[in-house]
């Protein structure tokens, strides 16, 4: 879904245009 380098730190979900979904390795089960 792209790099988070390009995501601006916004003050909340109301400012979001699309939902970014990073791969959270801590929640991946094998």
């Amino acid at each position: 879904c792209g790099s988070k380098d390009n995501i601006k730190h916004v003050p909340g979900g109301g400012s979001v245009q699309i939902v970014y979904k990073p791969v959270d390795l801590s929640k991946v089960t094998s």
Epitope: K4, H9, G12, G13, G14, V19, Y20, K21, L25
Partner: antibody, heavy 120, light 112 residues
Framework: QVQLQQSGPELVKPGTSVKMPCKAS????????ISWVKQRTGQGLEWIGE????????YYNEKFKGKATLTADKSSNTAYMQLSSVTSEDSAVYFC?????????????WGQGTSVTVSS | DIVMSQSPSSLAVSAGEKVTMSCKSS????????????LAWYQQKPGQSPKLLIY???TRESGVPDRFTGSGSGTDFTLTISSVQAEDLAVYYC????????FGGGTKLDIK
């Protein structure tokens, strides 16, 4: 696994400052916001502010502007909160939490809390 | 600022009963572009750190029992526990993250 490790209890004198760490592990520190939350004994949760470690940018609850300062050290995966000119009103437990920035904006992992007691 | 109001402030029920608690926001938490409500529910058991239960108003966090259900949209939200267990004794907080973050005052759940 994701962990947020906070320091032990702090006893601080009125008018002084205290700086507390929140050491993150088990995830990419710069991909998530760290929020700080205050809880006085027997009271509810109060959001202080947040920092995005990748850029160092911050947002604060208006009530805590001038009281709390949030910083982050990317080299040690540690976020810090400093409270200045403390009074008895600052006696509380302070939690750090990982905020799932960009998606749910929910705090999915929490530290165990640092208890701050202000007393002379 | 967005103000969050929870009710009731406390309630006591017997194990096995159904519980509902309310959370109201002073403005809509629905982002029309993402079609998400930026409302989360947290459980805080005595002496513990808060735990995330529900985000996006109705999405259960991984590992949370399915007896916990979040519902609502806009300004009115509800957390339902379909069959309360003894281990559900806790304070439940809603929190908005539409603009900055604000917690509600909490609902304390006691077990009779």
């Amino acid at each position: 696994q994701v962990q947020l490790q906070q320091s032990g209890p702090e006893l601080v004198k009125p008018g002084t400052s205290v700086k507390m760490p929140c050491k993150a592990s088990g995830y990419i520190f710069t991909d998530y916001v760290i929020s700080w939350v205050k809880q006085r004994t027997g009271q509810g949760l109060e959001w202080i502010g947040e920092i995005f470690p990748r850029s160092g940018s911050t947002y604060y609850n208006e009530k805590f502007k001038g009281k709390a300062t949030l910083t982050a050290d990317k080299s040690s995966n540690t976020a810090y909160m400093q409270l200045s000119s403390v009074t008895s009103e600052d006696s509380a437990v302070y939690f750090c939490a990982r905020d799932y920035y960009g998606t749910s904006f929910a705090m999915d992992y929490w530290g165990q809390g640092t208890s701050v007691t202000v007393s002379s | 600022d967005i103000v969050m109001s929870q009710s009731p402030s406390s309630l006591a029920v017997s194990a096995g009963e159904k519980v509902t608690m309310s959370c109201k926001s002073s403005q809509s938490l629905l982002n029309s572009r993402t079609r998400k409500n930026y409302l989360a529910w947290y459980q805080q058991k005595p002496g513990q750190s808060p735990k995330l239960l529900i985000y996006w108003a109705s999405t259960r966090e991984s590992g949370v029992p399915d007896r916990f259900t979040g519902s609502g949209s806009g300004t009115d939200f509800t957390l339902t526990i379909s069959s309360v267990q003894a281990e559900d004794l806790a304070v439940y907080y809603c929190k908005q993250s539409f603009y900055l973050r604000t917690f509600g005052g909490g609902t304390k759940l006691d077990i009779k």
